[in-house]
């Protein structure tokens, strides 16, 4: 696993602890809270990242409208069970025997039950929409100069793949970035929407998960763009199941 | 290496205006914003605004709106800030800064201008 | 406007002296936050931003801390060369600084 070998560091994942005791005194480094080996080449999972933050102490509208089944992470965080890969288990319970089913980026997509809850596989989140509202700049923002540079950002930054971001949308204040990537588009080594997504976010909330500085900061053609807020929509490829309760 | 070399002290006249520049080398000019920082004897640090030289954008403090102009000339990597009916409260230190490479704070910084408005 | 509150206004110390100063933000900056010294007839120099990144070049005996609305940077053992006043700025929204904290020798 690549790790910065001078000073036996994860690149891509602070929450780590790192040593030089891999194959032939290589660095290698393992996630706080699961202790499970990690990539320092690539993004850690979201499940991994969460558990590591729970051990830790403290013109025309161009706009898209998020479907109807659309999922916003309201539940915040918690201390997830991943699989041997990192990835969610499908069913998440916690301390109290209440049980859900999550999808892909972790999220609850049915209502909360009992240990005799069955969740029989992991739905895929396929399409992820980040939608931000930037505070006042000196002018609007070049929709291509903004496109390129969050284009530019998800590919170096976060190393997703360029086809993974379908679109940017801008209508000032406004800025929406659309991620979709379907089970049969992900081939090995490609890193998923939902990670990229997460580390963007945590990036944006000033926590960044790379070593090294806080946040991130962007700008467009030198223009600083600060962002006021930002909601993450998530859609599955099957739809969520929530009772009609929940809905009112 | 990035320098920001800003013009000398200026003694004037209630009333009258004033135009302090700003001359960057060392990288490139329209990559990066010019901020202006007002700073009273004895004071503290204000932000008063800044121009994306890429676009001539400019944003500015409220509290500044109406008598401050930035501007900015490419071909001479120089920004300038004007500053119009100048009465003695203006009497302070003005800085340029430039921007972290990759952060919002400000990194680099001239050494200052004194404007001294005295009748 | 976002106010920053810093606080003390001046404090006395020793060389040797472990130094704390604290600046607290009017909302949530994301640990958008700066810190700077300040020597008199110089212009500021940053010292940290993102709240806990180090300058290169600045002594490892500086140090940011903090989140939400409160931050705090910490000389662990004060030096001659440190004597100075120091600011802390947000930039989530737009660019604002504290009022300053003066560090005398005692």
């Known amino acids: 696993h690549t790790a910065a070998q001078d000073n036996c560091t994860c690149p891509t994942n602070k929450m780590t602890v790192c040593s030089p005791d891999g194959p032939g005194g290589r660095c290698q480094c393992r996630a706080l809270g699961s202790g499970m080996a990690v990539d320092c080449s690539t993004l850690t999972s979201k499940c991994l990242l969460l558990k590591a933050r729970m051990s830790a102490p403290k013109n025309a509208r161009t706009l898209v409208r998020p479907s109807e089944h659309a999922l916003v992470d309201n539940d915040g965080l918690y201390d997830p069970d991943c699989d041997p890969e990192g990835r969610f288990k499908a069913r998440q319970c916690n301390q109290t025997s209440v049980c859900w089913c999550v999808n892909s980026v972790g999220v609850r997509r049915t209502d909360k039950g009992d240990l005799s809850l069955r969740c029989d596989e992991l739905v895929r989140t396929h399409h992820i929409l980040i939608d931000l509202r930037h505070r006042p700049t000196a002018g609007a923002f070049n929709h291509s100069d903004l496109d390129a540079e969050l284009r530019r950002l998800f590919r170096e930054r976060y190393r997703l793949h360029p086809k993974f971001v379908a679109a940017v949308h801008y209508e000032q204040p406004t800025i929406q970035i659309e991620l979709r990537q379907n089970t049969s588009q992900k081939a090995a080594g490609d890193v998923d929407i939902g990670d990229a997504a997460y580390y963007f976010e945590r990036d944006i909330k000033g926590e960044s998960l790379f070593q090294g500085r806080g946040g991130l900061d962007l700008r467009v053609r030198g223009e600083p763009l600060q962002v006021e807020r930002t909601l993450i929509y998530y859609l599955d490829e099957i739809p969520p199941k929530f009772s009609m309760k929940r809905l009112t | 290496q990035v320098q920001l070399v800003q013009s000398g002290a200026e003694v004037k006249k209630p009333g009258a205006s004033v135009k302090v520049s700003c001359k960057a080398s060392?990288?490139?000019?329209?990559?990066?914003?010019i901020h202006w920082v007002k700073q009273k004897p004895g004071q503290g640090l204000e932000w008063i605004g800044y121009?994306?030289?890429?676009?001539?954008?400019?944003k500015y403090n409220e509290k500044f709106k109406g008598r401050v102009t930035i501007t900015r000339d490419t071909s001479a990597s120089t920004a300038y800030m004007e500053l119009s009916s100048l009465r003695s409260e203006d009497t302070a230190v003005y800085y340029c800064?430039?921007?972290?490479?990759?952060?919002?704070?400000?990194?680099?910084w001239g050494q200052g201008t004194l404007v001294t408005v005295s009748s | 406007d976002i106010q920053m509150t810093q606080s003390p206004s001046s404090l006395s110390a020793s060389v040797g002296d472990r130094v704390t100063i604290t600046c607290k933000a009017s909302?949530?900056?994301?640990?958008?936050l700066a810190w700077y010294q300040q020597k008199p007839g110089k212009a500021p120099k940053l010292l940290i931003s993102?709240?806990?990144s180090l300058e290169t070049g600045v002594p490892s005996r500086f140090s940011g801390s903090g989140s939400g609305k409160d931050y705090t940077l910490t000389i662990s053992s004060l030096q001659p060369e440190d004597f100075a006043t120091y600011y802390c700025?947000?930039?989530?929204?737009?660019?604002?600084f504290g009022q300053g904290t003066k560090v005398e020798i005692k």
């Open positions: 121009i994306n030289p890429n676009n001539d954008g400019t």
């Open positions: 993102g709240a806990t």
């Open positions: 060392g990288y490139t000019f329209t990559t990066y914003v």
């Open positions: 909302e949530d900056i994301f640990n958008r």
């Open positions: 700025q947000q930039y989530w929204n737009t660019w604002t």
């Open positions: 800064a430039r921007p972290h490479f990759e952060t919002h704070a400000m990194d680099y």
